[in-house]
């Protein structure tokens, strides 16, 4: 007997689709051998319709696929747009068609619903609304209108024009009688249940002259859409439930091991902790449709998801729903990248963001995930030279190292910078990743002065002290602007005396600005890098003022950070404290900025917490 197993009988209707799962013993030979679906002929042969090696018969072109799941020992044949011609006997199997490693499947496709012996067929999805139309003649216009449901041999009254409503339909049914011109009444049933399915009879009048109309109500469970996404990638569930539930609370839930469908996110503000930082429920349109983006897909995210509408914000009987079965492919094209990056107050982080290397010319973005309400991700910076105002001078998006990775540097960190950030592009929406920035105890490794004032026409020298741990790194100074940080010449002044217990490998590297002009005002960064990979940075704001006295200016660290034998050259500069120092012009008060670049359409924005690797802010 064959070890292959599947459904022996599949029944469906015209225009529908089927998904046939065939099971095989997952030996290494079976996992890699050819899988096929063939139709048995009258004379015993079996003609291949589709196989795992890419063959698709002309009969199946554009409407069928075969997907192998070697880790489960299954393959799935999806066939859409069924017609009665598809009815017949089939085999799903492994190897070659005639070898016998196969399973027989009978597929029967019946005629789609239509008008059969004066019965109007209504086919409606679970949770949706049906309107049963009931015509009548003029002589019954003033008489009682009623709808019955056939239960076994007996018709049971469901609703009538005198105000009766069967308790099973309370709160979800109404009878509408059209204007005098139209000889028609309608019964509208909302929040359809599976138990509503069956034969109905509508009637106008109660005597032998009454008008009757038969109706057959078929209530369908939604067929789950199969969704295959990569580990660490993202998925978007588009949920269109219809305008009739536009003002009802929406939800996305995941069927769990119990009977329940656990809420993942809903419009009432609930969000499952496992999705913190990596989910957005996009604002719904007027027609009630909405979408949910989940990023940083994990193995455990696989499963059946339902979206729906109900005032409770969770699945209830009569909720209109849509269903998906999410598979998470562990052989992911999306590379591992750190999902947690740590920095210290006053210090910096350098975040590596992966993107689809085929889309090197795409616009890169970085946004801050906000959990309030349904979640949003307002943009902070992009690769086209835009930086959100509050982040000027301390945030930069660099195309380096390129070839599938870009870098985001954020410095002058404060505890308020802790949170989840998303890397994304305007290209492949599956390549959205997340990183969590954590602010930990400690002091910045690079030491620079606080705000610095330069004098027009004079020379300014700004020091940056690098501890010995960065001895093998390239050290640089650059001038920050919206498009990045342009490298500047700098001088190595020898070992630094700013570090206790640090040997000759520490370094003092100075930035010199000769003949200072107004254009020199702005933010300057000193930092370390290894090739195209960036490490820590420190920022200094240089203000430019009119000449007061002649000479050049050297700027030192404040007394608090000076080595015991180091002379403080200019005690007029404020002491560096263990906190971020920012441009005082931006620091007076942080106002809520209604920023035009904030994502209203969060579907472009999204995250990766697929691995739990962590990355410190100080080095790669």
């Amino acid at each position: 007997k064959s070890p292959i197993f599947g459904p022996e009988e599949v029944n469906s209707v015209e225009g529908n689709s089927v998904s046939i799962t065939c099971y095989y013993p997952p030996t290494s030979v079976n996992r890699h051998t050819r899988k096929y679906w063939c139709r048995q002929g009258a004379r015993g042969g079996c003609i291949t319709l589709i196989s795992s090696e890419g063959y698709v018969s002309s009969k199946y072109a554009g409407r069928a696929n075969l997907t192998n799941f070697p880790e489960n020992g299954t393959f799935v044949v999806n066939i859409a747009q069924l017609s009665q011609d598809d009815s017949g006997r089939y085999k799903c199997g492994l190897g070659i068609n005639s070898r016998g490693l196969s399973f027989d499947v009978s597929l029967e496709v019946s005629q789609g619903p239509g008008l059969l012996n004066d019965t109007k067929v209504y086919t409606v999805d679970l949770g949706r609304t049906v309107t049963i139309n009931c015509p009548f003649k003029t002589e019954n216009a003033q008489k009682r209108k009623s709808l019955y449901k056939q239960i076994g041999l007996y018709p049971v009254l469901v609703i009538d024009s005198s105000g009766y409503v069967n308790p099973n339909y309370t709160g979800r049914i109404r009878l509408d009688i059209q204007g005098t011109g139209q000889l028609l009444f309608s019964v509208v049933i909302n929040q359809l249940r599976l138990s509503d399915a069956g034969q109905y009879l509508c009637q106008a009048g109660d005597d032998s002259n009454s008008n009757k109309k038969n109706a057959d109500l078929q209530v369908l469970k939604p067929e789950p859409e199969l969704v295959y996404e990569d580990l660490r990638g993202s998925v978007t569930f588009h949920c269109a439930l219809g305008p009739e539930v536009a003002n009802v609370a929406k939800f996305l839930c995941r069927q769990s091991s119990g009977e329940n469908c656990d809420v993942v996110v809903n419009t009432l503000g609930k969000r499952a902790p496992a999705f913190e930082g990596r989910i957005l429920l996009n604002p719904q349109d007027k027609d009630g449709s909405f979408s949910v983006v989940i990023t940083g897909l994990r193995k455990e995210d696989a499963g059946r998801y339902l979206c729906g509408a109900h005032s409770d914000g969770q699945l209830q009987e009569g909720s209109p729903i849509q269903a998906w079965q999410l598979f998470v492919n562990e052989e992911s094209t999306i590379p591992r990248s750190p999902t947690v990056v740590k920095g210290v107050a006053g210090g910096s982080v350098a975040v590596l963001c992966p993107y689809n290397r085929k889309e090197s010319k795409s616009i890169k973005y970085w946004c801050l995930w906000e959990g309030a309400q349904n979640g949003r991700c307002p943009l902070l910076v992009d690769s086209e030279g835009w930086v959100k105002a509050q982040y000027e001078g301390r945030l930069s998006l660099l195309e380096e190292p390129g070839n599938g990775t870009f870098t985001v540097i954020l410095n002058q960190l404060t505890s308020r910078d802790a949170g989840f950030y998303w890397c994304l592009t305007n290209g492949d929406t599956l390549w959205r990743t997340t990183v969590e920035i954590k602010i930990i105890e400690g002091e910045p490794n690079l030491k620079v002065p606080g705000n610095v004032t330069a004098v027009l026409g004079e020379t300014l020298k700004v020091p940056c002290h690098f501890p010995c741990k960065f001895s093998s790194y390239e050290k640089y100074w650059c001038k920050w602007n919206n498009t990045g940080c342009q490298a500047l010449p700098s001088q190595d002044e020898g070992p630094s005396k700013a570090f206790v217990n640090c040997d000759e490998n520490s370094r003092l590297v100075s930035l010199t600005l000769n003949l200072v002009t107004r254009a020199d005002e702005g933010w300057y960064w000193c930092g370390v890098k290894q090739g195209h990979f960036y490490g820590e940075t420190a920022a200094v704001y240089v203000a430019v003022e009119e000449r007061k006295a002649a000479g050049s200016r050297d700027v030192s660290l404040a007394k608090a950070d000076a080595a015991p034998d180091e002379k403080v050259l200019d005690s007029g500069f404020r002491e560096i404290e263990n906190k971020a120092i920012q441009d005082p012009r931006l620091f007076a008060e942080e106002k809520a900025v209604a920023d035009t670049r904030d994502q209203a359409d969060g579907s472009r924005a999204s995250v990766d917490s697929g691995s739990s690797e962590e990355q410190g802010g100080s080095s790669r």
């Epitope: 599949v10 209707v13 529908n16 689709s17 089927v18 998904s19 299954t74 369908l220 469908c261 009569g318």
Partner: nanobody, 129 residues
Framework: QVQLVESGGGLVQTGGSLRLSCAAS????????VGWFRQAPGKEREFVAA??????????YAADSVKGRFTISRDNAENTVYLQMNSLKPEDTAVYYC????????????????????WGQGTLVTVSS
Amino acid sequence: QVQLVESGGGLVQTGGSLRLSCAASGRTFSVYRVGWFRQAPGKEREFVAAVIWSGASTYKYAADSVKGRFTISRDNAENTVYLQMNSLKPEDTAVYYCAADPLGLPGPDVRVEGGYRHWGQGTLVTVSS
């Protein structure tokens, strides 16, 4: 929760027929698959048949040992699944259990007990020779 109650078991002679019923109540709107399993005295529970519905499609499964003899069907309006058992043999003697689950297609292998979250108490079928 979903409650399942089996009925229709009893004593029958070899070659005879029985129809088992599995009536579901509770949150039945979320049931997408129903299976029948059986456990003979001193043996492990084994798969007999299953039905999965998805949209307008229905998928029926049967174990090799009952193919051609047992048929699974359902009455959606009554929330009942039936197992029509014909040409019964003494080796069919067992307690028959009905199981249900909200996972339809794709989902766990229908033959695996772990693929079902709700179980009935069972009904005894005895086939005498």
